[in-house]
Amino acid sequence: SGTTNTVAAYNLTWKSTNFKTILEWEPKPVNQVYTVQISTKSGDWKSKCFYTTDTECDLTDEIVKDVKQTYLARVFSYPAGNVESTGSAGEPLYENSPEFTPYLETNLGQPTIQSFEQVGTKVNVTVEDERTLVRRNNTFLSLRDVFGKDLIYTLYYWKSSSSGKKTAKTNTNEFLIDVDKGENYCFSVQAVIPSRTVNRKSTDSPVECMGQEKGEFRE
């Protein structure tokens, strides 16, 4: 049902990485526009992206208010140029999104190795603590601030001269590993949230190798 030539949105999909969260949907509009509403399970609906011809809406500002809440969005379809018009039941056509809980579902972005420093036979590898758009007391929180000990990093490291990898874990953003003196090593890290059932792991960081500019060596 609905007004002539107006179709309901479909394939509503949450795209979220490190809490940057966009709702996407289809179809590309032909003679129609969309408005999005978002709500927590117990809250009021808030309208966003009014009468847009886009098929995406950035809802980050809403979800970062409480990343542990579960959100629902809906996309309303209106005839272009006649946004007051409603469907046959007296309401505009709309479609609901799947529920979305940012803390449990946002994808972990690709991490970055900030630095590594060798002191004798030890190397300290530091992972960049990426800033998110989640705020507390008017400051942006880092990924570690948000997830705390729920977030771990896995380090993969190997001698530049061989293919055999080793691994280590940390629930901070730093690794201290043993290496053979005089050998160059390469490093890659991955973020993991062990308690999750979906979107548990990030992709691996870019590989960084000793002898390149991010590193520092001290006897």
Partner: antibody
Framework: EVQLVESGGGLVQPGGSLRLSCAAS????????MHWVRQAPGKGLEWVGL????????IYDPKFQDRATISADNSKNTAYLQMNSLRAEDTAVYYC??????????HGQGTLVTVSS | DIQMTQSPSSLSASVGDRVTITCRAS??????LNWYQQKPGKAWKVLIY???SLAEGVPSRFSGSGSGTDYTLTISSLQPEDFATYYC?????????AGQGTKVEIK
């Protein structure tokens, strides 16, 4: 329901090879790390290695580095262990296990590999 | 590689006894230490992870403590179903290594 089913064990001649399979159901192996662990008769648990099926990273216990290859076919939701140059002391039950990154939460019933002439 | 030394290798106890098993790592493993239980001919299952966290569905009579290199599994009041072999595992760095196991038998 999460299930891991190992297969491919049996009697192998010393110096021979085998390929064990670990078919997973009830979850996507790409979301986890998959390990191989073995237990010789009457002995303790011994770690062989792991794979991150999504990224393809593999890590081995150095004692198996030259003889073991762990792989995964994500389209079949299956992990594999290839072991070469087998010797009598490789006789064991081989288990695959799912690792959350905090602990092994599921593993299979194991498949017995006997190396004997 | 990190060596895990578990003791005792076996112990005899009675139902209702308090049982303590220890595991020592050859260097600091930062609480990346899990305890598993294995019954004869059966699967092994996680009891404790991150040294002190009780796994889902595990009775509260099991507890874990320790940090650095020294860790302990305690069964506050041994039950008939607890007669089994217990293993500690470190998973902070590769290769993952296990203790030799502690077999808990009926006295």
């Amino acid at each position: 329901e999460v299930q891991l089913v190992e297969s491919g064990g049996g009697l192998v001649q010393p110096g021979g090879s085998l390929r064990l399979s670990c078919a997973a159901s009830g979850f996507n192996i790409k979301e986890y790390y998959m390990h191989w662990v073995r237990q010789a008769p009457g002995k303790g648990l011994e770690w062989v290695g792991l794979i991150d099926p999504e990224q393809g990273n593999t890590i081995y216990d150095p004692k198996f580095q030259d003889r073991a290859t762990i792989s995964a076919d994500n389209s079949k939701n299956t992990a594999y262990l290839q072991m070469n140059s087998l010797r009598a002391e490789d006789t064991a039950v081989y288990y695959c296990a799912r690792d959350t990154a905090a602990y092994f939460d599921y593993h299979g019933q194991g498949t017995l590999v006997t190396v004997s002439s | 590689d990190i060596q895990m030394t578990q003791s005792p290798s076996s112990l005899s106890a009675s139902v209702g006894d308090r049982v303590t098993i220890t595991c020592r790592a050859s260097r600091d493993i930062k609480s990346y230490l899990n305890w598993y239980q294995q019954k004869p001919g059966k699967a092994w299952k996680v009891l404790i992870y991150y040294a002190t966290s009780l796994a889902e569905g595990v009775p509260s009579r099991f507890s874990g403590s320790g940090s650095g290199t020294d860790y302990t599994l305690t069964i506050s009041s041994l039950q008939p179903e607890d007669f089994a072999t217990y293993y500690c595992w470190q998973h902070g760095e590769s290769p993952w290594t296990a203790g030799q196991g502690t077999k808990v038998e009926i006295k």
